[in-house]
Amino acid sequence: SEIPKGKQKAQLRQREVVDLYNGMCLQGPAGVPGRDGSPGANGIPGTPGIPGRDGFKGEKGECLRESFEESWTPNYKQCSWSSLNYGIDLGKIAECTFTKMRSNSALRVLFSGSLRLKCRNACCQRWYFTFNGAECSGPLPIEAIIYLDQGSPEMNSTINIHRTSSVEGLCEGIGAGLVDVAIWVGTCSDYPKGDASTGWNSVSRIIIEELPK
């Protein structure tokens, strides 16, 4: 629809006034300073500095690998018996004296031989190592047990199996020098002993080896 001619004129005049003032706008007073901006990103790395002075000479170190390879020689011993056939139920069975070269080493010990336990009722027997008469305490005793329960009532007889077995372990905290390593047979706590036999009809051996820690 058409706009009346009077209204058109008024609109043109308004626009001219606005345009005129836009072109002549004076600058006002400075505003309050704005807040600081966020920190900028890191700059590029600087050039390396000049090398520092040499440090003081360090103390002579110990090469572990070198000292181990040069000074650790294998140290082991085997004592063997062709037929111990030892029927004791309590006491020392066999002994082997070993020369331990260092204090800060462990002893690995092994007894291998036939073991037998028999009884009509429940019984238990313990085979264990001693070192100069004392059991290992570094960390715990080296032992093996055989427990035999009573057989069925109708079988009024005892089973008699001799089986080659081993008692083995590591013991720490034993000083350098002569060490008497012995295998003993004894009782288990709270159980009656039976009829034990060690080393029947076969070779028995104690093997002792010194190991670095």
């Epitope: 002994e95 020369t99 260092r102 204090s103 008469g133 350098a176 020098g177 002569l178 008497d180």
Partner: antibody, heavy 119, light 108 residues
């Protein structure tokens, strides 16, 4: 109380023999290595020989090897040192010394017995 | 074989004072070192083992320290009964039956 009592020392001619004894009490003798240590007049301590508790192992100082023999009788709690082909330089006070059961330091010593080798 | 060297050979100290004796091993022996005291005409007596542990009946004025190759025996408030010869011995490595040559502690 641990006690070690040596005996058997005396005057002997060069080339002669002597047997020293050491009677032990107050500890489990068979569990301990035993030693002989000697001291020449005005000198320091010189280890002579050691024997394990069981008697299964023995060692000697080079200066006495082949001439001296260490032994023990665990049933009698007694240590022995048989000394043969004695020399003037063997003149010393001989001590019997008990090694600690686990580490080889000497925790008890006898009072010593004097051996003099002279012509 | 490890060689044990003691110093000084002779040490003169007044009663009531402190004495410090040294023992050096030719190689490391951990803490496996013993000290012995020997008075004239008597057998040696164990004073210290494990470098720093006093043997039974040894007074607290005796103390040991050190580890590796350097060891020290210190006697505080010296009494007349303390003057004697002192020996060290390592028992870390076989053969361990070598003693130091001894230090004579005498009254100043």
């Amino acid at each position: 109380e641990v006690q070690l009592v040596e005996s058997g020392g005396g005057l002997v001619q060069p080339g002669g023999s002597l047997r020293l004894s050491c009677a032990a009490s107050g500890f489990t003798f068979s569990n301990c290595a035993m030693n002989w240590v000697r001291q020449a007049p005005g000198k320091g301590l010189e280890w002579v020989s050691v024997i394990s508790g069981s008697g299964g192992g023995t060692y000697y100082a080079d200066s006495v090897k082949g001439r001296f023999t260490i032994s023990r009788d665990n049933s009698k709690n007694t240590l022995y040192l048989q000394m043969n082909s004695l020399r003037a330089e063997d003149t010393a006070v001989y001590y019997c010394a008990k090694a600690n059961w686990n580490y080889a330091y000497f925790d008890f010593w006898g009072q010593g017995t004097l051996v003099t080798v002279s012509s | 074989e490890i060689v044990m060297t003691q110093s000084p050979a002779t040490l003169s100290v007044s009663p009531g004072e402190r004495a410090t004796l040294s023992c050096r091993a030719s190689q490391r022996v951990s803490s496996n070192l013993a000290w012995y005291q020997q008075k004239p005409g008597q057998a040696p007596r164990l004073l210290i083992y494990g470098a720093s542990t006093r043997a039974t009946g040894i007074p607290a004025r005796f103390s040991g320290s050190g580890s590796g190759t350097e060891f020290t025996l210190t006697i505080n408030s010296l009494q007349s009964a303390d003057f004697a010869v002192f020996f060290c011995q390592q028992y870390d490595i076989w053969p361990m039956y070598t003693f130091g040559q001894g230090t004579k502690l005498e009254i100043k």
